[in-house]
């Protein structure tokens, strides 16, 4: 009986540790996408509607803030699209890029952790164009560090929650 009690206590401890594991899945806020063709920081994301969720991490001022030291898997998916109903592309040659950046407040510094994308020729003869970028990686993050997303050509972003999103989840502690 004691073994059983010990076992269930262990399960409970494991479960509560798992429930405390930080994670975030943030989806683009379509009502507040910046315009332009230059590289811009995307600051408007949902954290609590649709597919978007956050636990034991903080979302503030457009940045995902780490609350616990650890090794995290970071990911971002960015979709670009253009349909002729919205007008013509002013240029048919495009650089479609995403940058996942880490900013440290304690030692003021910024590093690009991941980038992805391509140069594209989106011909004016086509009715519809689409391009998707997915990046992911495993990083050591410290409490207080901030993750942000920058993209080129934000006015071409696909505003759907299943198209443009980023997130993180803690995989293990730092030994």
């Amino acid at each position: 009986e004691k073994a059983m009690v010990d076992g269930s206590w262990l399960d409970l401890a494991k479960r509560s540790k798992l429930e405390a594991q930080p994670f975030a899945h943030l989806t683009i806020n379509a009502t507040d996408i910046p315009s332009g063709s230059h590289k811009v920081s995307l600051s408007s994301w949902y954290h609590d509607r649709g597919w978007a969720k956050i636990s034991n991490m903080t979302f503030s001022n457009g940045k995902l803030i780490v609350n616990q030291d650890g090794f995290y898997y970071l990911y971002a998916n960015i979709c670009f699209r253009h349909h002729e109903t919205s007008g013509d592309l002013a240029t048919e040659y495009l650089q479609l890029m995403v940058y996942v950046t880490k900013t440290s407040i304690k030692i003021p510094s910024s590093h690009t952790l991941m980038k992805g994308g391509s140069t594209k020729y989106w011909s004016g003869n086509s009715e519809f164009h689409f391009y998707s970028i997915n990046v992911g990686g495993f990083f050591k993050l410290r409490s207080g560090e901030e993750i942000s997303i920058e993209v080129s050509n934000p006015s071409l972003l696909d505003p759907d929650q299943d198209a443009t999103y980023f997130g993180a989840f803690k995989v293990r502690d730092i030994d």
Epitope: S35, G36, T85, A90
Partner: antibody, heavy 126, light 103 residues
């Protein structure tokens, strides 16, 4: 204030060419696209083409492809539309119009024509 | 190629009347629809863009609505200076125009 001032009326014989100018003032010419639209007597407005005044990129209606040339002189803040091999059905009022999208902030030519020239009557008659 | 169809082609109304012009697209165009006013010998004027946004300087008696393939331009109280031909437009396609006259 924003103004587009077009050149005066022209009369041409069939087979000839015409070049219409559109001088812009009151804004940074290079930051916007200029469209050319025409209206033949009793007809609807008809889009002909655009030029991105910043980089010189152009797009034309299939109907005018091969007959139309649109250029710009950024120093003079002026756009030009030349139509060749004129026929009687090209008799129309030709307008230039500014696209509302500021190319510094946007990558899409939106086809919202927020300012127009006064129009240039081109008559093609033998 | 998208085709824009306006109705009616002409209308006659009294000063102060509410006037409605309809524009249909041959396929869905979301809200990418603009309205222009044309008066003889004058530069055309953008009234409404993006189906319902009023262009700066345009009187508030003009309004636009609709999305998808059906749109309307409404003049809430017709004024003598509103005598003109009105055109709807989506990118490269214009409607055939609606001529508005005073009774």
């Amino acid at each position: 204030q924003v103004q587009l001032v077009q050149s005066g009326a022209e009369v041409r014989k069939p087979g000839a060419s015409v070049k219409v100018s559109c001088k812009a003032s009151g804004y940074d010419f290079s930051n916007y696209a200029i469209h050319w639209v025409r209206q033949a007597p009793g007809q609807r407005l008809e889009w002909m083409g655009w030029i991105n005044a910043g980089n010189g990129n152009t797009k034309f209606s299939q109907k005018f492809q091969g007959r139309i040339t649109v250029t710009r002189d950024t120093a003079a803040s002026t756009a030009y539309m030349e139509l060749r091999s004129l026929r009687s059905e090209d008799t129309a009022v030709y307008y230039c119009a500014r696209d509302s999208s500021n190319m510094v902030r946007a990558i899409i030519i939106a086809y919202y024509f927020d300012y127009w020239g006064q129009g240039t009557l081109v008559t093609v008659s033998s | 190629e998208i085709v824009m169809t306006q109705s009616p082609s002409s209308l006659s109304a009294s000063v102060g009347d509410r006037v409605t012009i309809t524009c249909r697209a041959s396929q869905s165009i979301s809200r990418y629809l603009n309205w222009y006013q044309l008066k003889p010998g004058k530069a055309p004027r953008l009234l409404i863009y993006g189906a319902s946004s009023l262009q700066s300087g345009v009187p508030s008696r003009f309004s636009g609505s609709g999305s998808g393939a059906e749109f309307t331009l409404t003049i809430s109280s017709l004024q003598p200076e509103d005598i003109a031909t009105y055109y709807c437009q989506h990118t490269r396609a214009f409607g055939q125009g609606t001529k508005v006259e005073i009774k």
